[in-house]
Each structure stands twice: as structure tokens, then as C-alpha cells.
């Protein structure tokens, strides 16, 4: 079953390469188990950036080596992606799946264009 | 008389606060005197950033204290805005006027969204 997912159109990564955005899913009821996946689309290629399954009311737990962290509140997921470089500029799509209880619901956002600018290197200290 | 003006939708300022974009106007004939104005729109307020009048084939000359520089080639104007800070993020609109010979033509672009990220300060050297 299809589900509406909203996310901002544009986000700027900080000069430290950190970008945060909210992914909000409009469910007709309260799910107990939700899976959130961040996909990156660039040059018509789609790759998975990170994913987490969480029980509503609990924290999102990404893998230890993941570049993503997140928190949830109601149907809103606050996602943070770190370690971004200019070459990571692209469209980051939020995919939400209501895993339990059945039936399964799937929602895919329109994507957030994340712009990343590499910082100028600091001058060497003499 | 109306005239079509094209400019990119989005540009990222460098970490040094420099943003460049091309403003191209579709003139029905060959003008000899052209005026280019850059306007900034933010929070429904429009302010003039800089302006230059030039003779086709010659360099654009902005005022000495202007944050803009530029070059022209045919109907294309290469504009560079410097000294940008995060607070300067906004929609930068290119306005082109064909001043001479008559008739007078006016064209206004859809604007270029310039995103600016302030760099992290470098650590103090001991």
C-alpha cells in the first residue's frame, strides 16, 4: 500500500560535511515497527546510503559504521548524514516502510537535494 | 519590449564565498550598449546587488566598491559575486536592458538560487 512521505527539497551540508533533514510519513494508523532507508540518486544511479529499523517510541539504530544517525518523534524521523564531501552532492531520497503490523505500507519521498561544498584547507602553521 | 533572459536555477558559492553564473539574453538585434543589473530577492524583498553598463565587445565595469565582477561574450554575461556569507543565500535575478540603439528592450531572468555556507574557522596556530 502506498503512503505519502514528505521531505525538504533542498538542504545545505555544513562546512563540516554534516546535513540534517526531517522525513515525515503520513500513515493512516500507528505502526509499531518502521524501516527508514536513505537512497542517493546521482546520474540516474540509485545507491543505498543507510537504513534503520526501529520500534516506534524507541531510538533509530543505524549500523556502527553508518554515516547516518537519527531520532524519531511520532511520524517524523530526523536524519543526519555526516562525512559528506562535494562529490556527495546529490538527491537523497527517504524511503519509509511500515513493517508491522500488517499490511505492509511503503512510501518514497521526492528527495532532498543536498549540496556539499568542500572547505578550503587551513594554512599550515609555521 | 520584452526579452528572454536565461540563467541557471542553482549555484553553490565556494567556501571562499564566491559564486559565478552566466546570464544570457536573447536579443532580437545587435545592441551596442547593454546594462546588466543583479537583484537579490529574499523574504519577498528585492534589493539591487550591483549593476554595470557596457559597450558590446568591451569589458563590464562595475563600481570600485562593488562585490560583482564580470565579462561578456556575445549575448552572454559571466557574472561573479564575491564576499558572500551564509546570510546572503537567496535568489539572484539577472536583469538585462538594451539601452542603445532604440527601441529599448528589457529582460528579467527567473533567478539563480545561490547557496552560501560559512566556513569553519581555522584553529589558532600556537
Amino acid at each position: 500500500k502506498a503512503m505519502h512521505v514528505a521531505q525538504p527539497a533542498v538542504v545545505l551540508a555544513s562546512s563540516r560535511g554534516i546535513a540534517s533533514f526531517v522525513c515525515e510519513y503520513a500513515s493512516p494508523g500507528k505502526a509499531t515497527e518502521v524501516r527508514v532507508t536513505v537512497l542517493r540518486q546521482a546520474d540516474s544511479q540509485v545507491t543505498e546510503v543507510c537504513a534503520a529499523t526501529y520500534m516506534t517510541g524507541n531510538e533509530l539504530t543505524f549500523l556502527d559504521d553508518s554515516i547516518c544517525t537519527g531520532t524519531s518523534s511520532g511520524n517524523q524521523v530526523n536524519l543526519t548524514i555526516q562525512g559528506l564531501r562535494a562529490m556527495d552532492t546529490g538527491l537523497y531520497i527517504c524511503k519509509v516502510e511500515l513493517m508491522y503490523p500488517p499490511p505492509y505500507y511503503l512510501g518514497i519521498g521526492n528527495g532532498t537535494q543536498i549540496y556539499v561544498i568542500d572547505p578550503e584547507p587551513c594554512p599550515d602553521s609555521d | 519590449k520584452a526579452m528572454h533572459v536565461a540563467q541557471p536555477a542553482v549555484v553553490l558559492a565556494s567556501s571562499r564565498g564566491i559564486a559565478s553564473f552566466v546570464c544570457e539574453y536573447a536579443s532580437p538585434g545587435k545592441a551596442t550598449e547593454v546594462r546588466v543589473t543583479v537583484l537579490r530577492q529574499a523574504d519577498s524583498q528585492v534589493t539591487e546587488v550591483c549593476a554595470a553598463t557596457y559597450m558590446t565587445g568591451n569589458e563590464l565595469t562595475f563600481l570600485d566598491d562593488s562585490i560583482c565582477t564580470g565579462t561578456s561574450s556575445g549575448n552572454q554575461v559571466n557574472l561573479t559575486i564575491q564576499g558572500l556569507r551564509a546570510m546572503d543565500t537567496g535568489l539572484y535575478i539577472c536583469k538585462v536592458e538594451l539601452m542603445y540603439p532604440p527601441p529599448y528592450y528589457l529582460g528579467i531572468g527567473n533567478g539563480t538560487q545561490i547557496y552560501v555556507i560559512d566556513p569553519e574557522p581555522c584553529p589558532d596556530s600556537d
Epitope: 505519502h4 503520513a26 500513515s27 493512516p28 494508523g29 500507528k30 505502526a31 509499531t32 518523534s73 511520532g74 511520524n75 511500515l98 503490523p101 500488517p102 499490511p103 505500507y105 | -
Partner: antibody, heavy 119, light 106 residues
């Protein structure tokens, strides 16, 4: 399309039990969703009574917890309401409806059945 | 229990006009708000869920908005078939309904 249909006696005497059936077509009640009973009192107020989930677990309105039971017959694709020790205050139109999740919006409803509690 | 205060309890409007109904909740419900249309002899019909999402097949004349404890529901370009009673429902904790708004056409 999913359809729900309530049935049961229109008149119940005080202190007796009220029993209603909701027959579901177009979707298996064991496949998903929660299957609810809601009632509307003569003044138009709607009250959620409780549900039985796809897995057979229940959730009831705390105000009714001691008197209510919702069960099901999976072979007939039906679920049932039993309300004990009824009084005239239980006179209402009773609806069955479906919702997603623990709590949720009811996307399909029956047309309702009127129950009067009177001696 | 979360209490929903729906207002007005009744209203009269002209064909082609616009009406707005409000629903105030006794605590923040995280946008878990639904709106129903109810006509005599039928079951309620789900119009909107999660504050503003139109149920498939519902005309865009119907809309919802809100957050926290304050929610509203509007019908634009009123049509004769809109005569009904409208209810709000929260589904953040248990399922509870507002008192209803009876809409009539002038």
C-alpha cells in the same frame, strides 16, 4: 472492495448481554488491520469500544473493559461483540470498522445496526 | 483519555461557499487526526487522515490542517451532497472522536 455488515437483535432487555456480529467480505481479517466496534448514542456522540487485531489480540476502551469481549471466527471471516450487563445507556447504533495499526483512522465501516435496551 | 472539542456543533452555509470546522485536543496528538463525513443510515466515511492527507477518491474540495493541539477541516465550493455531520478523531492514544458538526445548506 472491502465490505463490513453488522447484524444482531435490535432489542435487548436490561441486565442481559448484547451480542452482535460483523461479517467481512473482500479482505481476510487474519491478513492485517484491527477490527473495531464503535457506537453512536442518540445524541450523535461516537464512542470507540474496542478491537480485535489480525493476530487475535484485543484492545478495549478502559470505560468498558469489565463488560466487553470481542472475539472472531476466522473460518467465517466474522468478528463479534459481546457487551454484558446492559442498561438503557447502551442504547445506540453499533458500527464495525477497520483501521490500520495500534490506533488509526477507520477506512471502512459497516452501515450500522440499531440496538435498543428496554424492558 | 484525550478529549476532542469540536466546534461549531452546527453550521449553515451557502452552495459554492466555504466552511471550516475546528477540533481542539486536550494534548499534543502528533498530527494523528482524521476527519469523517456521516450521513443518516450509512457508516461514517473517512475523508482525511494524518491531519491533511486525502483518502483516495475524496475530492480536493476537502482539506485539513493543524499540529499540536489545534486542527481544522475545510470544505470549499460547497455542494448539496455535502449535507452531513462531520467528526474529527484522534488516533495518537486510543481512538476518540469529537462531538460532531451538523452542516446544512442555506
Amino acid at each position: 472492495d472491502v465490505q463490513l455488515q453488522e447484524s444482531g437483535p435490535g432489542l435487548v432487555t436490561p441486565s442481559q448481554s448484547l451480542s452482535l456480529t460483523c461479517s467481512v467480505t473482500g479482505y481476510s481479517i487474519t491478513s492485517g488491520y484491527s477490527w473495531n466496534w464503535i457506537r453512536q448514542f442518540p445524541g450523535n456522540k461516537l464512542e470507540w469500544m474496542g478491537y480485535i487485531r489480525f493476530d487475535g489480540n484485543n484492545n478495549y476502551n478502559p470505560f468498558l473493559k469489565n463488560r466487553i469481549s470481542i472475539t472472531r471466527d476466522t473460518s467465517e471471516n466474522q468478528f463479534f461483540l459481546k457487551l454484558n450487563s446492559v442498561t438503557t445507556e447502551d442504547t445506540a447504533t453499533y458500527y464495525c470498522a477497520r483501521n490500520y495499526g495500534t490506533w488509526g483512522a477507520m477506512d471502512f465501516w459497516g452501515q450500522g445496526t440499531s440496538v435498543t435496551v428496554s424492558s | 483519555d484525550i478529549v476532542l472539542t469540536q466546534s461549531p456543533s452546527s453550521l449553515s452555509a451557502s452552495l459554492g461557499g466555504k466552511v471550516t470546522i475546528t477540533c481542539k485536543t486536550s494534548q499534543d496528538i502528533n498530527k494523528y487526526m482524521a476527519w469523517y463525513q456521516h450521513k443518516p443510515g450509512k457508516g461514517p466515511r473517512l475523508l482525511i487522515y494524518y491531519t491533511s492527507i486525502l483518502q483516495p477518491g475524496i475530492p480536493s474540495r476537502f482539506s485539513g490542517s493543524g499540529s499540536g493541539t489545534d486542527y481544522s477541516f475545510s470544505i470549499n465550493n460547497l455542494e448539496p451532497e455535502d449535507i452531513a455531520t462531520y467528526y474529527c478523531q484522534q488516533y495518537d492514544n486510543l481512538n476518540t472522536f469529537g462531538g460532531g458538526t451538523m452542516l446544512e445548506i442555506k
